[in-house]
């Protein structure tokens, strides 16, 4: 059953799975933050066999995989903001 749809609520996922997907079967992971008419965060896993699965964001295994993506996306040292002192 295809689990990803465009609905009137603008959520992509109709149902979510917590079933573990081994990393070797994963092509990419799409993280959609809540907003744009969808009240919840959605995680879409694109598998190498071209199938698409919506995953429960609370599933422990997907959280670890998301950490890999977050680590990489946060890997540039933040530039400090210097406020000019007013005499």
């Amino acid at each position: 059953v295809l689990e990803v749809y465009y609905t009137s609520l603008r959520c992509r996922c109709v149902q979510e799975s917590s079933v573990f997907i081994p990393r070797r079967f994963i092509d990419r992971i799409q993280i959609l933050p809540r907003g744009n008419g969808c009240p919840r965060k959605e995680i879409i896993v694109w598998k190498k066999n071209k199938s698409i699965v919506c995953v429960d964001p609370q599933a422990e295994w997907i959280q670890r995989m998301m950490e890999v993506l977050r680590k990489r996306s946060s890997s540039t040292l933040p530039v400090p903001v210097f406020k000019r002192k007013i005499p």
């Epitope: 990393r23 070797r24 680590k71 946060s74 040292l77």
Partner: antibody, heavy 119, light 112 residues
Framework: QVTLKESGPGILQPSQTLSLTCSFS??????????VGWIRQPSGKGLEWLAH???????YYNPALKSRLTISKDTSKNQVFLKIANVDTADTATYFC???????????WGQGTTLTVSS | DVLMTQTPLSLPVSLGTQASIFCRSS???????????LQWYLQKPGQSPKLLIY???NRFSGVPDRFSGSGSGTDFTLKISRVEAEDLGVYYC?????????FGGGTKLEIK
């Protein structure tokens, strides 16, 4: 078990290009979250990170050397390559490749290959 | 760049005693996702480095429980509760939070 092995020319003259190969087994760079990086160590000195490449071909370089570095991979052959252009005597070092597995940075290392730059 | 400063440079110890190695980063290495990617390695003479501790305090697979890591923000410590002969070598801290990834200068653990 996971193994990595570096190979290189051993000796180069200044201004030549260094080509290094990292051949690995028991993991694949086609797997989500996997990466391979290069680190070097001049004799008797500390470790310097050079570059790494991820499963999806995203690449990161040490800014101090970025203009001279090129990292690439051949996923089907389980190999990662590093090129360093315009070498100098300061590039004389042992060069290591190491695996990245998600948030374990460099959890398994190769034995290293030694480069001497001399005219 | 994040500069990693290790102390002491050399640490003479007696076998069976505790050893502590310190590492300080020039910037906080807590990523904005809340994680701190601070690792410790041991490099024995003529060998490549081996991972001991990841994410500040987690022992890597096969690492004896006499090794422990602690710290937060910019200050980190590696403790070896009872030093054994096989623990001798150079210890490096490493930060993988921000590019360029950087290593400490190393601490040589040697017999007193």
């Amino acid at each position: 078990q996971v193994t990595l092995k570096e190979s290189g020319p051993g000796i180069l003259q200044p201004s030549q290009t260094l080509s290094l190969t990292c051949s690995f087994s028991e993991f694949s760079l086609s797997v989500f979250g996997m990466g391979v990086g290069w680190i070097r160590q001049p004799s008797g000195k500390g470790l310097e990170w050079l570059a790494h490449i991820w499963w999806d071909d995203e690449k990161y370089y040490n800014p101090a050397l970025k203009s001279r570095l090129t990292i690439s991979k051949d996923t089907s052959k389980n190999q990662v390559f590093l090129k360093i252009a315009n070498v100098d005597t300061a590039d004389t070092a042992t060069y290591f490749c190491a695996r990245i597995d998600g948030y374990y940075d460099f959890d398994y290392w190769g034995q290293g290959t030694t480069l001497t730059v001399s005219s | 760049d994040v500069l990693m400063t290790q102390t002491p440079l050399s640490l003479p110890v007696s076998l069976g005693t505790q050893a502590s190695i310190f590492c300080r980063s020039s910037h906080s290495i807590v990523q904005d996702n809340g994680n701190t990617y601070l690792q410790w390695y041991l490099q024995k003479p003529g060998q490549s480095p081996k991972l001991l501790i990841y994410k500040v305090s987690n022992r890597f697979s096969g690492v004896p429980d006499r090794f422990s890591g602690s710290g937060s923000g910019t200050d980190f410590t590696l403790k070896i509760s009872r030093v054994e002969a096989e623990d001798l070598g150079v210890y490096y801290c490493f930060q993988g939070s921000y590019v360029p990834y950087t290593f400490g200068g190393g601490t040589k653990l040697e017999i007193k």
